[in-house]
Structure formats: structure tokens, C-alpha cells
Amino acid sequence: MKVLQEPTCVSDYISLSTCEWKMGGPTNCSAELRLVYQLVFLISETNMCVPENNGAAGCVCHLFMEDMVGADNYTLDLWAGQQLLWKGSFKPSEHVKPKAPENLTVYTNVSETLLLTWSNPYPPDNYLYEKLTYAVNIWNENDPTDSRIYDVTYQEPTLRIAASTLKSGVSYRARVRAWAQSYNSTWSEWSPSTKWYNAYKEPFEKH
């Protein structure tokens, strides 16, 4: 049994880290492998993750890491029974992938303006709470080429756009994702999308 692609891990920097790797051949990850992880700290326990399959040879493990701080460093040991397949380490603060924003809502009754709001996925006492900025993706349900990204470079989880910038009488969808520039994070997954009908009508022109 051999590791083809070594585990790579990302952390949501609140309670969970996710590690993925590939084996040399088809593997029943949960039956054959265990990922042992331990905070490098004198009295920390050695916890263990039972991996799940991610494709025929791919494995994924979700590691519980509460109360994360910048200095936290974990040792990782991948075992097949009593055989150590791989040994490594992981510093959550250096591999941040934020949680996806939540509760995306579109308000269409704000005079010719669309108001999109969502919630920051972190509690106010978390390090990432004030570090997140966002990207909003809006697209036409019937026309995949009619898609746009709005960068929300401020921290307030809202976006206002003129309804006139979208086609009238068309159903649109929106989704939002987050990143933390100061942590050099990757982008979060996209939030679930929300749908609305753009009923905006062009003002009647006088000649």
C-alpha cells in the first residue's frame, strides 16, 4: 500500500480542517486507513480520523481542531493498520479556507436597486470575522454567458446593484464566497445560490 499524492490540508480556522490524499490504487479508505493527528503541545491527545473515499483511490478526512490560534501546529501520521505510510505536519493558520457565507438573500423591493445580503459565517470573537471580503456571482438562469462577478472589498456583507444592469423579465441566481487576504487564504466554497425574478421595467421614454 502506497501514498501517491501526499495529504494536503486546509482549515476553516474555527473548528475543522480537511485533508485529502490519493493512494496508489483502489482503496477502501475507511476500512484500511487511519489519519492520526495531534496538536504539538505537551498535554494534547492523539486524535484519530477515519477517512472516507473521494473517488476510487482518493481519501478525505475531517479533523476536529477547536480554539485554533496562529501558533497551532499539528503532527499528522497516516497509518494502514500498524504500518506508517506517511508522516507530516500542518499549521492551520497557514492553510486557511474560510467557511462559505450563509443566508444569502435578495431584496427586490428597494426602488430600482437590488439589495443582496448574507451573513458572515464566523462568530464575532473569531480571528477571521473582521478579515473576510467577498465575491458575488450573479448569472442569468437561461443564458450561461450572462454571468458576472462583483468584488465586495469592504467587510459589510451586502451588495447593492442597479436592477437596470440586469435584463428585465429574466430569472437570475446569485451566490457568494469569501476569502481572508491577511491570512493568504484560498476562496471559500460558494454559498448555496438564491433565485429571483428581475421585474425591473425600463422607464417610459418621452420623445
Partner: antibody, heavy 129, light 109 residues
């Protein structure tokens, strides 16, 4: 110093109730581990009662014999875990230990305790009339 | 899950090699720990994950086994090792933790 300190033990009449406390110091009680209770009757072996996950998912596990009469709870703001014992009987007389435990998890929803690494000094509960 | 520990007691001399066994009633992989307890004291963790030595535990203690059969070995018994030893098995199918009945190690003679 990292330690667990139990309190609340004492003499209680059969049928009575008692709440034991376990105060954690030197580490955050809300970090990634389980907090558990284990008891030992005089001259007998160790007996697991149950555990509560200290982090954001407060999942609990109990020994089958403890379900219903024994309840484990926590107050992370006080770094304290509790054991509420009801309908006490003479056979519940024991030293009650608080212990911190490692865990095994599968996915994000299945997480269970699997060994006790750090123990308190224990508190004696005597059930007698 | 049931944990059958044997022997229940044994007498030995300083320097002896001591072996204690623990048998689980179902496959518990390597979810087994060993503890040492002295009178009036809390148990002390010796071994976890069947064979991993806990921090600060002397190397004369070792553990082996997986599945249903496990062994704790003290390679050369020291005066401070006279105590009661317990195994602890964990079943993730039920989330339960069960201790063995204990093995009391006393001084021979």
C-alpha cells in the same frame, strides 16, 4: 499547571440527587476533546459513565446502565463539566473521577471518545441512610 | 463489548518480565489503552492506540495487538510497578468504553 479538580461529593440518602463538578485549568475546556466521568466502587474496578464533547458540537455518550439517571453537561465559560446523578442507590457509592479523553471521528458528524489521558483526583460519593 | 482481562492477579519479583492480556468480545481495531493504578490514586495512562507509549512512561512498558487480542508487557519489573493494571477498550460502533476487570501485580514472597 494542567489539571482537573472534582468537587461536590459527599453523603446522600438513597433516592436522592447529587451534582458533581469538574473544573479544568491550564487548558480550554472548549477545545477539541471529550470530558468524561469514570467511577470506582470501593475495592472494585473502573467503570465508565459517559462523556461530553467539549467543542462546538456538544455530543454526549453514556454507558447503557447510566442512561436516564445520569446526565453530563458543561459550562465552557466556567471551564467546568458536571455530572448530575438522580435516584441514587447504595451501589452508586464510589469515587467519581473526571477525565479528559481523545477521540476518533468519521466525517463531521460521527465523533466518539476512545481513551482517557488526564484524570482528576476523584471525589467520594457515599449513598447511605 | 466486553473486555476480559487475565490474570486477575499475579505475583512477581523485581526484574521479572510480566505479561497481561486483554480480550475484546468484538473487533475494536487498535482502540485499546492500558492504565496503571495505585491505591488511593487516579489511574495513569500507560499505552494508547494499543501500542503507543504515553508521554513520560518508561520504555519498559509496551503494548501490542489489534482486533480482539491485546497484551501489556513490562520487560523488567521495577519496585514502583507494583500496582493494578486495567485495559480500556473503545467500540466506535456503539460509542462505548469498557474497562477490563483489572490485574493486581504484587511482590512475590
Amino acid at each position: 499547571e494542567v489539571q482537573l479538580v472534582e468537587s461536590g461529593g459527599g453523603l446522600v440518602q438513597p433516592g436522592g440527587s447529587l451534582r458533581l463538578s469538574c473544573a479544568a485549568s491550564g487548558f480550554s475546556s472548549s477545545s477539541a476533546h471529550y470530558m468524561c466521568w469514570v467511577r470506582q466502587a470501593p475495592g472494585k474496578g473502573l467503570e465508565w459513565i459517559g462523556c461530553i464533547y467539549a467543542g462546538s458540537r456538544g455530543s454526549t455518550y453514556y454507558a447503557s446502565w447510566a442512561k436516564g439517571r445520569f446526565t453530563i453537561s458543561r459550562d465552557n465559560s466556567k471551564n467546568t463539566v458536571y455530572l448530575q446523578m438522580n435516584s441514587l442507590r447504595a451501589e452508586d457509592t464510589a469515587v467519581y473521577y473526571c477525565a479528559r479523553a481523545a477521540f476518533v471521528n468519521r466525517g463531521v458528524s460521527w465523533i466518539w471518545p476512545y481513551y482517557f489521558s488526564l484524570w482528576g483526583q476523584g471525589t467520594l460519593v457515599t449513598v447511605s441512610s | 463489548i466486553q473486555m476480559t482481562q487475565s490474570p486477575s492477579s499475579l505475583s512477581a519479583s523485581v526484574g521479572d518480565r510480566v505479561t497481561i492480556t486483554c480480550q475484546a468480545s468484538e473487533d475494536i481495531e487498535s482502540y485499546l489503552a492500558w492504565y496503571q493504578q495505585k491505591p488511593g490514586k487516579a489511574p495513569k495512562l500507560l499505552i494508547y492506540r494499543a501500542s503507543t507509549l504515553a508521554y513520560g512512561v518508561p520504555s519498559r512498558f509496551s503494548g501490542s495487538g489489534s482486533g480482539t487480542d491485546f497484551t501489556l508487557t513490562i520487560s523488567s519489573l521495577q519496585p514502583e510497578d507494583f500496582a493494578t493494571y486495567y485495559c480500556l477498550g473503545s467500540s466506535y460502533s456503539t460509542g462505548s468504553n469498557i474497562f477490563g476487570t483489572g490485574t493486581k501485580v504484587t511482590v512475590l514472597g
